[in-house]
């Protein structure tokens, strides 16, 4: 099926940028692995590179606004022509769920005191308003709560006294449009505005003063431009050469708004000054190699010695990595394929241990299954031997750092009947459902 092809994939937002055009196949679009595509406008953007997991989304809002709840985040397998780690197809979502608490307590409503006395009338003549108030303290609200209703109320009051009202002008109305929009017409362009003696009108009993001055004003229109001339397009120019040597590119034609040139504020030509076409080199673009993550360190050994475990004897170990994905004469991976370091082996060594503090609470598991639970632990942690942190292995080569390697066997005093791990479990509360955010937008 044809797709919309884009020249960029924005990792931070997961959006396609730089529309190249539509009506091409995924295979043609992805001749360049830097490109990206959408199956429909506004749909999910997939990059052309090998699939890998997106960044985790931000945590969704807590499922409740007060007390303890839960919140979800997700990441998506994005890419083309392959699978993410764990044999996961592009487009698949992976979820994480954790406990949250926006506010420890929930708001509680308060109650009103009785109404206070009425204040005096707001005016000394004619009619006004008077007000009375009450306090939100019977009882006071808790944890950001409030009292229902209003803290004050007003009612009309009448002084039984008549006020005299003097006339005052309302603001000038707008100038009427000029009778012509450019110079050289049959009539002298004029504009007029008016105002009313209504802010307020003068009273009759007792009598108020009328407004001073005139209710109308007229003037000549000044600064009018000469009458405008609209622009017109010239012919299309030649098609530009295809700007890329591999994958898809874009060629362009241009035209100029000079047939005639717009004058005296006349409108510019309608439509585009350029138009583009997709050009296809049918040549795949080079793909640079990328290092896989480092493999594990090999066991710590010393040549010609059966075992150096649990001894103050430095050994050596190595780890490797693989350069993957290089195609079509792309760059080789820069840097070393093997890493070597010096080490002391503490593999399966009995060591004195001490109990750690509680770890932070783990994620809720399973994130999308029934009754998710979280846990935290205290571990029996080994105390490492005080061996020299650096050694000089070869004369004249200087000091080298030495790292402890291995999984020792720590010994701690029993804690809550356990010798290695004490675990505390807790259910996750107010768990939201796992829903694909792309489907929610539709």
């Amino acid at each position: 099926d044809p797709v919309l092809c884009f020249t960029q994939y924005e990792e931070s937002s997961g959006k396609c940028k730089g529309l190249l055009g539509g009506g091409v196949s995924v295979e043609d679009c992805c001749l360049n692995t830097a490109f990206a595509y959408q199956k429909r406008s506004g749909g999910l953007c997939q990059p052309c590179r090998s699939p890998r997991w997106s960044l985790w989304s931000t945590w969704a809002p807590c499922s409740v606004t007060c007390s303890e709840g839960s919140q979800l985040r997700y990441r998506r397998c994005v890419g083309w022509n392959g699978q993410c780690s764990g044999k996961v197809a592009p487009g698949t979502l992976e979820w994480q769920l954790q406990a949250c608490e926006d506010q420890q307590c929930c708001p509680e409503m308060g109650g009103w005191s009785g109404w206070g006395p009425w204040e005096p009338c707001s005016v000394t003549c004619s009619k006004g308003t008077r007000t009375r108030r009450r306090a939100c303290n019977h009882p006071a609200p808790k944890c950001g709560g409030h009292c229902p209703g209003q803290a004050q109320e007003s009612e009309a009051c009448d002084t039984q006294q008549v006020c005299p009202t003097h006339g005052a002008w309302a603001t000038w109305g707008p100038w009427t449009p000029c009778s012509a929009s450019c110079h050289g017409g049959p009539h002298e362009p004029k504009e007029t505005r008016s105002r009313k003696c209504s802010a307020p009108e003068p009273s009759q009993k007792p009598p108020g003063k009328p407004c001073p001055g005139l209710a109308y004003e007229q003037r000549r229109c000044t600064g009018l431009p000469p009458c405008p001339v609209a622009g017109g397009w010239g012919p299309w120019g030649p098609v530009s050469p295809c700007p890329v040597t591999c994958g898809l590119g874009q060629t362009m034609e241009q035209r100029t708004c000079n047939h005639p040139v717009p004058q005296h504020g006349g409108p510019f030509c309608a439509g585009d000054a350029t138009r583009t076409h997709i050009c296809n080199t049918a040549v795949p673009c080079p793909v640079d190699g990328e290092w896989d993550s480092w493999g594990e360190w090999s066991p710590c050994i010393r040549r010609n010695m059966k075992s150096i475990s649990c001894q103050e004897i430095p050994g050596q170990q190595s780890r490797g990595r693989t350069c993957r994905g290089r195609k079509f004469d792309g760059h080789r991976c820069a840097g070393q394929q093997q890493d070597i370091r010096h080490c002391y082996s503490i593999q399966h060594c009995p060591l004195k241990g001490s109990w750690s503090e509680w770890s932070t609470w783990g994620l809720c598991m399973p994130p999308c299954g029934p009754n998710p639970t979280r846990a935290r632990q205290r571990l029996c942690t080994p105390l490492l031997p005080k061996y020299p942190p650096t050694v000089s292995m070869v004369e004249g080569q200087g000091e080298k750092n030495v790292t402890f390697w291995g999984r020792p066997l720590p010994r701690c005093e029993e804690l809550q009947g356990q010798k290695l791990v004490v675990e505390e479990k807790r259910p996750c509360l107010h768990v939201p459902a796992c829903k694909d955010p792309e489907e929610e937008e539709l």
Epitope: G353, S359, R407, P408, L409, K419, L420, V421, E423
Partner: nanobody, 125 residues
Framework: QVQLVESGGGLVQPGGSLRLSCAAS??????IGWFRQAPGKEREGVSC????????YYADSVKDRFTISRDYAKNTVYLQMNSLKPEDTAVYYC????????????????????WGQGTQVTVSG
């Protein structure tokens, strides 16, 4: 002493799937792992999972086919085995690791003990 009980083995055709379960009677261990022993061969590590951070490790021969998972509430560990091959035929054992989970070192390097009785998996056409 933590007791382990494995279940879920059986006879399956090549390309088929099985799900093994290992129920633990306690929780005093750093990691839990699945091992297997074919007739006339040494016991080899298949997959393991750290109790402390949930990180998982797999032998190269089973990567992308086997998945290890855990149910906190039931104190049970599962091994989902897909795309099974005749060379996966063995007795599968569950074991507990009492070696400290030093960062970056696979729990397959652990000190495993407290083995269960094992469950037979046979892959045959």
């Amino acid at each position: 002493q933590v007791q382990l009980v494995e279940s879920g083995g059986g006879l399956v055709q090549p390309g088929g799937s099985l799900r093994l379960s290992c129920a633990a009677s306690g929780s005093d261990y750093y990691a839990i792992g699945w091992f297997r022993q074919a007739p006339g061969k040494e016991r080899e590590g298949v997959s393991c999972m750290s109790r402390t951070d949930g990180s998982t490790y797999y032998a190269d021969s089973v990567k992308d086919r086997f998945t290890i998972s855990r149910d906190y509430a039931k104190n049970t560990v599962y091994l989902q085995m897909n795309s099974l091959k005749p060379e996966d035929t063995a007795v599968y054992y569950c074991g507990l690791d009492r070696s400290y989970p030093t960062g970056g070192i696979s729990c397959l390097f652990g000190d495993f003990g407290s083995w269960g009785q094992g469950t037979q998996v046979t892959v045959s056409g």
